[in-house]
Interface confidence: medium
């Protein structure tokens, strides 16, 4: 492993569309892939009138935007669907929205996924 890199071997899995996609609704997903590729965890969610609605969580393919991120943080300002990715086992258990704004001070909104992860 590259020095300082946090290897991702498994991620929290969740799929709101699990029945149609023929998957489990929630669980732990092992992350497979070529040995020369980095693997990440991700989370996507919506904010419906202040209520967090998780869309999907799981493993994510090698993506430079996820490199060396130990926390799953969305930095875009008010996206329609929030997305974050990270490196490290189960790093997508918690995710947060931390918009990068020029003037106002950023505020963190950590989210604990529901339903909770289980083996």
């Amino acid at each position: 492993a590259i020095l300082g890199r946090s290897e991702t071997q498994e991620c929290l899995f969740f799929n709101a569309n699990w029945e149609k996609d023929r998957t489990n609704q929630t669980g732990v997903e092992p992350c497979y892939g070529d040995k020369d590729k980095r693997r990440h965890c991700f989370a996507t969610w919506k904010n419906i009138s202040g209520s967090i609605e998780i869309v999907k969580q799981g493993c994510w393919l090698d993506d430079i935007n996820c490199y060396d991120r130990t926390d799953c943080v969305e930095k875009k300002d008010s996206p329609e669907v929030y997305f974050c990715c990270c490196e490290g086992n189960m790093c997508n258990e918690k995710f947060s929205y931390f918009p990068e704004m020029e003037v106002t001070q950023p505020t963190s909104n950590p989210v604990t996924p529901k339903p909770p992860y289980y083996n």
Partner: antibody, heavy 120, light 107 residues
Framework: EVQLLESGGGLVQPGGSLRLSCAAS????????MHWVRQAPGKGLEWVAS????????GYADSVKGRFTISRDNSKNTLYLQMNSLRAEDTAVYYC?????????????WGQGTLVTVSS | DIQMTQSPSSLSASVGDRVTITCRAS??????LNWYQQKPGKAPKLLIY???SRASGVPSRFSGSGSGTDFTLTISSLQPEDFATYYC?????????FGGGTKVEIK
Amino acid sequence: EVQLLESGGGLVQPGGSLRLSCAASGFTFDDYSMHWVRQAPGKGLEWVASINYNSGYKGYADSVKGRFTISRDNSKNTLYLQMNSLRAEDTAVYYCARAANWHDTALDYWGQGTLVTVSS
Amino acid sequence: DIQMTQSPSSLSASVGDRVTITCRASQSILRYLNWYQQKPGKAPKLLIYAATSRASGVPSRFSGSGSGTDFTLTISSLQPEDFATYYCQQSDNLPLTFGGGTKVEIK
């Protein structure tokens, strides 16, 4: 080197059956979900079916549901597509392709394809 | 099913040109969008996955952008070997669906 080699294509009459195989090498086969994608002559790509690493999940296009069955034998590093009740519109080149996860469906390696012709 | 609409269906360009192909999904697919290149008589080849990430061995002149419903594949400087048909594909939901393809021809 990753290799996927399809076989089993050929000419078959409407209503007939064929079994396609895809022999995989150069990677750990049972780490990957596998897919069949087809392409009718002069047309675009159409997803046909997929199966996850341990055969726990399978998915089919509506156009083949109930007629085609996807399966795999991890001990033989081989993917299969059993095609029954074939129709003229099933005529196509059939490709097998791999994907890292069930929902991570970027198809990063493809076979060269095998041609299935359904005609009387 | 999620419909994928690609445009244009064909285009003529010269070596060195900047080429842009667009793909629109009928509903949000987050970043689950992949691009493939196919040459006559050959299997498709993965170019871009997760909307923006280049696959192994793909030249840097190929880039992808977009999220949600609108996506773009850009070839910054067209090379002779780039004349081919390009397909987008969504992998957000089953069934997986492809765009109709964009044929890039020599002007």
